[in-house]
């Protein structure tokens, strides 16, 4: 997240990160039911870690942390290359959370957001728009759905219904590192980090984001059937 | 700057391993989040991939090459290697190693040019 | 694997003319194309990524253009220095990385 602030401990409890190797931070994640999380179809790794109610970047110890293996990752099958539609994945956790006040799912809005909808996007990505340089603890930026013109404006040819941007403050975006984390918007799921232009946080290059509300049968079709 | 020197020996003997290092000077190779890209070029010929490794020590092969080659890095020494075996006089050519800059973040992020390059080195294969 | 195959393979120019060198994916490659200049001896040099943007010091007589399969690289006006040979190239997210045959810029 460029030019975002710390977020409160505790405030995303729905907050997941996927890890490689010992501790290395890939994405970001969302608990949405007590065993499933949904990320970014481009997070697939054969394997991984995840850690949810954590708010260091550090593997110190939390005593709100709880540590999971990945049991299933189903991503979406309309995911394709080079267009990055249905940038979305289902991952089943090797068991269920302990509900806590740090870890605690998130809603997934029914609805399409609307231009204008302020929300919320969190994770440990990168806080240099060309760099690396990541943050000690999450980090939250409040961003702006933005209409569908100006998202296919901003990136012609490459933006569909399963997409919306928002963000567009330049200084301010998403970015390396934050993939598959959440956008929450009045309280509920809105989108996922799917991608943007390097370096992130230019003007008139905003983030874009998997538009939930077009995938809500299909998360709980696979729910239900996994 | 940036700057990649590859080094390794000139001559191979067919058959044998073609071992390159490509090290990396004026930034850290483990500090970004950069694709390290081994490519190669026949004489008189165009450009071909050899591999990549990216900053989570995930390797990507071309096709054509892959039982035969081994990409790695070691950030101690700030250096990348490329090790080719069993080769033949078709594996004769310049071979460069450069940076892959990625060109956006996210699903974009597998995406890359590469910005930044060694001058290359001549391996011949030959007994 | 994503074939890009370059035309013309080679052309003569005089400096001050316009040059255009063209670029096709087998199949679409989004906006994910781009474009290097090789001279004699030396290491490739990117001149274009992601199919229209400009390089970092890269003179603005270059210019990329086009999406999904077909790309083209123009020179406005060549330049003495611009005889070179251009090829092409398609990141993909799954390998091969493949490069177009190049085009040899020659004087007339």
């Known amino acids: 997240i460029v030019n975002g602030s710390d977020c409160q401990k505790d405030a995303q409890p729905w907050q997941g990160a996927l890890l490689l190797g010992p501790n290395k931070l890939y994405c970001g994640a969302v608990l949405i039911s007590p065993q499933w999380l949904l990320t970014a179809a481009h997070c697939r790794k054969p394997v991984f870690r995840i850690r949810l109610g954590h708010h260091s970047m550090s593997p110190v110890y939390e005593s709100g942390q709880q540590m999971f293996q990945g049991i299933k990752s189903i991503p979406h099958p309309g995911y394709s290359h080079p267009g990055h539609s249905n940038d979305l994945m289902l991952i089943k956790m090797n068991r269920k959370i302990r509900d806590s006040h740090s870890v605690k799912p998130v809603e997934i809005a029914c609805d399409c957001a609307t231009e204008g909808t302020r929300c919320m996007v969190s994770g440990w990505g990168t806080t240099s728009s060309s760099h690396n340089n990541f943050p000690k603890v999450l980090q939250c930026l409040n961003i702006t759905v933005l209409s569908e013109e100006r998202c296919k404006n901003s990136y012609p040819g490459q933006i569909d219904k399963t997409m919306f941007c928002a963000g567009d403050e330049e200084g301010r975006d998403s970015c390396q590192g934050d993939s598959g984390g959440p956008v929450v918007c009045n309280g509920k799921l809105q989108g996922l980090v799917s991608w943007g232009d390097f370096p992130c946080a230019q003007r008139n290059r905003p983030g874009v984001y998997t538009n939930l509300c077009e995938f809500v049968k299909w998360i709980k079709d696979t729910m239900n059937s996994n | 700057q940036l700057q990649l020197q590859e080094s390794g020996p000139g001559l191979v003997k067919p058959s044998e391993t073609l071992s390159l290092t490509c090290t990396v000077s004026?930034?850290?190779?483990?500090?970004?989040?950069?694709?390290w890209v081994w490519i190669r070029q026949p004489p008189g010929k165009g450009l071909e991939w050899i591999g990549s490794?990216?900053?989570?020590?995930?390797?990507y092969y071309s096709p054509s090459l892959k039982s035969r080659v081994t990409i790695s890095v070691d950030t101690s020494k700030n250096q990348f290697s490329l090790k080719l075996s069993s080769v033949t006089a078709a594996d004769t050519a310049v071979y460069y190693c450069?940076?892959?800059?990625?060109?956006?973040?996210?699903?974009?992020?597998?995406?890359?040019?590469?910005?930044?390059w060694g001058q290359g080195t001549t391996v011949t294969v030959s007994s | 694997d994503i074939q890009m195959t370059q035309s013309p393979s080679s052309l003569s120019a005089s400096v001050g003319d316009r040059v255009t060198i063209t670029c096709r994916a087998s199949?679409?490659?989004?906006?994910?194309l781009n474009w290097y200049q090789q001279k004699p001896g030396k290491a490739p040099k990117l001149l274009i990524y992601?199919?229209?943007s400009l390089q970092s010091g890269v003179p603005s007589r270059f210019s990329g253009s086009g999406s999904g399969t077909d790309f083209t690289l123009t020179i406005s006006s060549l330049q003495p220095e611009d005889f070179a040979t251009y090829y092409c190239?398609?990141?993909?997210?799954?390998?091969?990385?493949?490069f177009g045959g190049g085009t040899k810029v020659e004087i007339k």
């Open positions: 450069a940076r892959g800059r990625p060109l956006g973040y996210g699903a974009k992020h597998y995406y890359y040019g590469m910005d930044v």
């Open positions: 004026g930034g850290s190779i483990s500090s970004d989040d950069y694709y």
């Open positions: 490794i990216d900053y989570y020590a995930s390797t």
């Open positions: 199949q679409s490659i989004s906006s994910y």
């Open positions: 992601s199919a229209s």
């Open positions: 190239q398609q990141s993909p997210y799954f390998p091969p990385l493949t």
